[in-house]
């Protein structure tokens, strides 16, 4: 038999890691293997998440908490709780429907994920380009042209329009 101390709803006495088993006189049965309950008073245990394929286990499931997944090397997490894994690209690239593509001139991506972003337009802040941008790095803005010695000049190319089809999948 099972002793509890609650005089109200017997299920309220069931702690995390157990469920209130209506088929067995509402005793607090331990969650079966590969299932969990993270709060008390639950009438079922939830099935543990399984990190398979491109997912790998970051934290094992237990009777009171679900497993947590991350992504295998070459992929990164997307969505709440790493609900999806997306392919990494190299720095200087972005993921398109056709795979990883180099950033267009005037744009950069300094990460293995995300989209290519336009170089900073230094002239909008009244500054000049100190270091040119690359596919992997943004431009580095320097002092404004007025601060430069006479005869010095700096040209900042306009940021090109984004090409269609360059959003991540």
């Amino acid at each position: 038999f099972e002793r509890t101390r609650s005089l109200q709803d017997p299920c309220s006495n069931c702690p995390a890691g157990t469920f209130c088993d209506n088929n067995r006189n509402q005793i607090c049965s331990p969650c079966p293997p590969n299932s969990f309950s993270s709060a008390g008073g639950q009438r079922t245990c939830d099935i543990c998440r399984q990190c398979k394929g491109v997912f790998r286990t970051r934290k094992e499931c237990s009777s009171t908490s679900n497993a947590e997944c991350d992504c295998t090397p070459g992929f990164h997490c997307l969505g709440a709780g790493c609900s999806m894994c997306e392919q990494d690209c190299k720095q200087g690239q972005e993921l398109t429907k056709k795979g990883c593509k180099d950033c267009c001139f005037g744009t950069f991506n300094d990460q293995k994920r995300g989209i290519c972003r336009p170089w900073t337009n230094c002239s909008l802040d009244g500054k000049s380009v100190l270091v040119n941008g690359t596919k992997e790095r943004d431009v580095v803005c320097g002092p404004s042209p007025a601060d430069l010695s006479p005869g010095a000049s700096s040209v900042t190319p306009p940021a090109p329009a984004r090409e269609p089809g360059h959003s991540p999948q």
Partner: antibody
Framework: EVQLVESGGGLVQPGGSLRLSCAAS?????????PCWVRQAPGKCLEWIGC?????????YDANWTKGRFTISRDNSKNTVYLQMNSLRAEDTAVYYC?????????????WGQGTLVTVSS | DIQMTQSPSSLSASVGDRVTITCQAS??????LAWYQQKPGKAPKLLIY???TLASGVPSRFSGSGSGTDFTLTISSLQPEDFATYYC???????????FGCGTKVTV
């Protein structure tokens, strides 16, 4: 080292009481690890006595034959579980084992103590 | 209450033999069954849990099967260290749910 160590066994007269202890080391009882008691009379089968929820709740699971004579309790601060045995009879003579019932092992007993002998005799 | 019935209660076998032990539950326990090995004067050792999952460090010659009420422990090729008593246990908690079978003694 991960282990369970029982103590408190010995000779007791019929009708008497005894409290066995089981100290856990190398791990903590939790919602994933329930401490249990199992006994084995000389030359006989294993007999399940009961278990207690490993977390902070006092839920116990007991074999019906104990009829309240045996009570399992736990002191989390000492990581120790107890078996209080009252109204002892000659047929309670047995080796008493403490075992860990683990969620990770399908609630099977994946860790056992060495056992402590209880002899009920006048 | 759940009762566990093991058979046979004892058996004689030789090294290299295939040995099969059965366990029957008085009501369905799904796959919530464990098998143990016990040698004289020692505590039981977990062999198999969840009816068919081998416990850590247990040789692959041991295997378990079954679900519901009927379960089997098989030793594919008996080794000298396997002579012992084997117990099944329901791990279906509550209502006397964790009962043991009464063992099968495997002797030479």
């Amino acid at each position: 080292e991960v282990q369970l160590v029982e103590s408190g066994g010995g000779l007791v007269q019929p009708g008497g009481s005894l409290r066995l202890s089981c100290a856990a080391s190398g791990f903590s009882f939790s919602a994933n690890y329930y401490p249990c008691w199992v006994r084995q009379a000389p030359g006989k089968c294993l007999e399940w006595i009961g278990c207690i929820y490993g977390g902070s709740s006092d839920i116990t699971y007991d074999a019906n034959w104990t009829k309240g004579r045996f009570t399992i309790s736990r002191d989390n601060s000492k990581n120790t579980v107890y078996l209080q045995m009252n109204s002892l009879r000659a047929e309670d003579t047995a080796v008493y084992y403490c075992a860990r019932s683990a969620w990770y092992s399908g609630w099977g007993g994946d860790l056992w103590g060495q056992g402590t002998l209880v002899t009920v005799s006048s | 209450d759940i009762q566990m019935t093991q058979s046979p209660s004892s058996l004689s076998a030789s090294v290299g033999d295939r040995v099969t032990i059965t366990c029957q539950a008085s009501q369905s326990i799904s796959n919530r069954l464990a098998w143990y090995q016990q040698k004289p004067g020692k505590a039981p050792k977990l062999l198999i849990y969840s009816a068919s999952t081998l416990a850590s460090g247990v040789p692959s010659r041991f295997s378990g099967s079954g679900s519901g009420t009927d379960f089997t422990l098989t030793i594919s090729s008996l080794q000298p260290e396997d002579f012992a008593t084997y117990y099944c246990q329901s791990t279906y908690y509550g209502n006397d749910g964790n009962a043991f079978g009464c063992g099968t003694k495997v002797t030479v």
